[in-house]
């Protein structure tokens, strides 16, 4: 047996007209410490009883996990990245078998020089992180490598990374056109074969705050939306105050239901309120009470 401790109630009338009484403090708790009856059924919406209270699943909260939160935590990554798979042909170095072995001194030296050269090429790109050689093969030296780009997460991160990949393409095309061998000699740090430059593939971090918000909102996905504040995404229902999409319930309380957000209007000693936004107040007629 579970006893409910009596609490003061506030009378709320839904915008459809029915009066609802809700506890103004949430202290409906078991009196006895022994587990009696099926505690599992007490936790709704997939919540589970941990022996003391209901552990609720997103987006629910409350004593029995019967209420829907106004906002859901979504955490975009600190940084987002792109990886470009490129191939360039270095003509100023002749391929030797030692270059196949990534732990050889020759490979390490080539890697160092190639990295230095690419750092110079991409020096003006703020998103540029570095290069990673994946394979070296004959011809003179065909260098298969990744160009790594990274930027801080903002709502426009895709545009920033797309722009950076375009600049990478322009810069590598320029250097492999300009730094070429003359009379079998190279005056630059490295020389290239102009026709050997190819962009194989571009992979960009995929993060969609709207998708994460919808997933976490589950059956309320149509009513939760993403709004930005200081470039940070917030997953909110219209019941969360302080956002453009916030519902103003005036003289009432916003509550989420499976049909969306609705206002539960209050009734005070002097007025009752109605309307979709609880903004229509009607004064109660004055009755004299005799004591």
């Amino acid at each position: 047996p579970l006893a409910t401790i009596p609490v003061s109630t506030t009378s709320l009338t839904s915008s459809e007209g029915s009066t609802i009484s809700t506890p103004s403090v949430d202290i409906s708790t078991p009196v006895t410490t022994s587990i009696v009856g099926d505690q599992c059924s007490r936790c709704k919406n997939g919540g589970f009883w941990d022996g003391l209270k209901c552990q609720c699943l997103t987006p629910y909260y409350g004593e029995s996990c019967e209420e829907v939160v106004n906002s859901i935590d979504i955490a975009p990554p600190e940084t987002v990245s792109a990886q470009m798979e490129l191939t360039v042909t270095v003509t100023s170095v002749k391929f030797t078998d030692e270059l196949k072995n990534h732990s050889s001194q020759e490979f390490r030296e080539f890697n160092k020089t190639f990295t230095e050269q690419m750092n110079i090429v991409y020096s003006g790109i703020p998103e540029y992180v570095g290069v990673n050689i994946t394979n070296l093969r004959l011809g003179s030296v065909v260098v298969e490598h990744d160009v790594l780009l990274r930027t801080k997460y903002t709502p426009e991160y895709k545009t920033a990374l797309d722009n950076a990949t375009e600049v990478v393409k322009q810069k590598i095309t320029k250097v492999t056109t300009e730094q070429i061998m003359t009379n079998d000699n190279c005056s630059a740090l490295m020389c290239f074969n102009t026709t050997g430059t190819q962009v194989q593939n571009i992979t960009v971090t995929q993060y969609d705050p709207v998708e994460e918000c919808r997933q976490k909102a589950e059956e309320y996905e149509d009513y939760f939306l993403v709004e930005y504040r200081d470039q940070k995404p917030y997953c909110i229902s219209p019941c969360e105050s302080g956002f453009n999409a916030s519902k103003n319930c005036n003289h009432g309380k916003c509550q989420m239901s499976q049909n969306g957000a609705r206002c539960l209007c209050v009734t005070t000693e002097t007025h009752w309120y109605s309307g979709e936004d609880c903004n229509q107040g009607t004064q109660k007629s004055h009755h004299h009470h005799h004591h």
């Epitope: 100023s92 170095v93 002749k94 020759e106 030296e109 020089t113 000699n185 190279c186 005056s187």
Partner: nanobody, 123 residues
Framework: DVQLVESGGGLVQPGGSLRLSCAAS????????MAWFRQAPGKEREGVAF???????SYAESVKGRFTISRDNAKNSLYLQMNSLRAEDTAVYYC?????????????????WGQGTMVTVSS
């Protein structure tokens, strides 16, 4: 650890000859590229000549026909025979090496360097 030590520098009259040597230790002389660079006072370091592991050589235009680069793999040594020396050849001469088969006289491509030997051409 790779160590390169130059010798053979000195004072010589215009039209004279000098032979520079570079002893390489810790460097597999049968591989990669060895080169001579020079730096005149107040000027940038410039490539003089380089030689690859297969004996392929290349020279700066200013020294072609006068200087000869060679290497002795058995002795782990590099040489620069300088004939018909001119006043403008006055500089500190450096030996440099790379484990890679390079076709460049860009100094940044060579990770290993000697301390240099001074060559002065003056009457």
């Amino acid at each position: 650890d790779v160590q390169l030590v130059e010798s053979g520098g000195g004072l010589v009259q215009p039209g004279g000859s000098l032979r520079l040597s570079c002893a390489a230790s810790g460097f597999p002389s049968s591989r990669g590229t060895m080169a001579w660079f020079r730096q005149a006072p107040g000027k940038e370091r410039e490539g003089v000549a380089f030689i690859n592991s297969d004996g392929r050589t290349s020279y700066a235009e200013s020294v072609k026909g006068r200087f000869t680069i060679s290497r002795d793999n058995a002795k782990n040594s590099l040489y620069l025979q300088m004939n018909s020396l001119r006043a403008e050849d006055t500089a500190v001469y450096y030996c440099a090496a790379s484990l890679l088969y390079l076709m460049t006289v860009n100094a940044a491509a060579y990770p290993y360097w000697g301390q240099g030997t001074m060559v002065t051409v003056s009457s």
